[in-house]
Amino acid sequence: LTCLGGFASPGPVPPSTALRELIEELVNITQNQKAPLCNGSMVWSINLTAGMYCAALESLINVSGCSAIEKTQRMLSGFCPHKVSAGQFSSLHVRDTKIEVAQFVKDLLLHLKKLFREGQFN
């Protein structure tokens, strides 16, 4: 439910159930993809390491008018402690490569599945 920014953290570790919800949403996107996702929009590639959730959100937030990823954008906000706005790149340390949203989602999904299997939820 909650909207809303702020920096007070209810705990730094996303539980497995919350991560599973995010993974399931990414799976839905990849499986239900017919036409090019988000009309083939390009986003910055990110390093799938520390600060990944905020970085992923900062990259995807710049895609507008794409209902297919709106739930993903919203879910990612629950894993990032600060407010993210379009054009903000504080967590995107490297901005030298752009990829299609579809590829970005696939890469993120593969990485999150790996983390889930390994029990790494932070």
Epitope: L1, T2, C3, L4, G5, G6, A8, S9, P10, G11, P12, V13, P14, P15, T17, A18, R20, E21, L22, Q73, R74, M75, S77, G78, F79, C80, P81, K83, S85
Partner: antibody
Framework: EVQLLESGGGLVQPGGSLRLSCAAS????????MSWVRQAPGKGLEWVSA????????YYADSVKGRFTISRDNSKNTLYLQMNSLRAEDTAVYYC????????????????WGQGTTVTVSS | SYELTQPPSVSVSPGQTASITCSGD??????ACWFQQKPGQSPVLVIY???KRPSGIPERFSGSNSGDTATLTISGTQAMDEADYYC?????????FGTGTKVTVL
Amino acid sequence: EVQLLESGGGLVQPGGSLRLSCAASGFTFSSYAMSWVRQAPGKGLEWVSAFSGSGGSTYYADSVKGRFTISRDNSKNTLYLQMNSLRAEDTAVYYCVQDGLGPYFYNYGMDVWGQGTTVTVSS
Amino acid sequence: SYELTQPPSVSVSPGQTASITCSGDKLGDKYACWFQQKPGQSPVLVIYHDSKRPSGIPERFSGSNSGDTATLTISGTQAMDEADYYCQAWDSSTYVFGTGTKVTVL
């Protein structure tokens, strides 16, 4: 379809206790934070308490801190609000709300609200 | 404690634009949400993340948030939009609701 059904409201005397329940269905209850929000007759919305879905942290409005206790039973998909030392100003409709996902649930937006249960504190 | 202030009432003619403001210290640094509540009904989320609309919310509802003010705009206001509107934000481990604005469609 996501549904929230509150129960347990009623008439109670000042100083008394009441426990509200909220039965949830249609979503993975344990993944989501949940909140209670109340609305006194003819007044605005007031957030009461929240229970995160990530590690069991609880949050309270100053007006109820030390008197109300939020809890949840993920095996029963149920959220609770134990209200003690009730006062006349606690009279309100109490809404159960599906909150956000993840450790920073408050960034998400309160999507789904129950129909509310009425609590009246009066002698 | 953190406070969000809204005008008590806003009047608008059908088809015209209604703007509701929500003021709070550095509100632009937080995500703002907006809720619509009609008499006898539960609140409904109409805007989250400052300007995003949940599915099912008409395009005439839009939002913005910067500085100390968040704004809900209803373009081409219809009679069915007559309701109370509340902004909301999170500050220091608590949710805060705005004081509420009654929108009347003349």
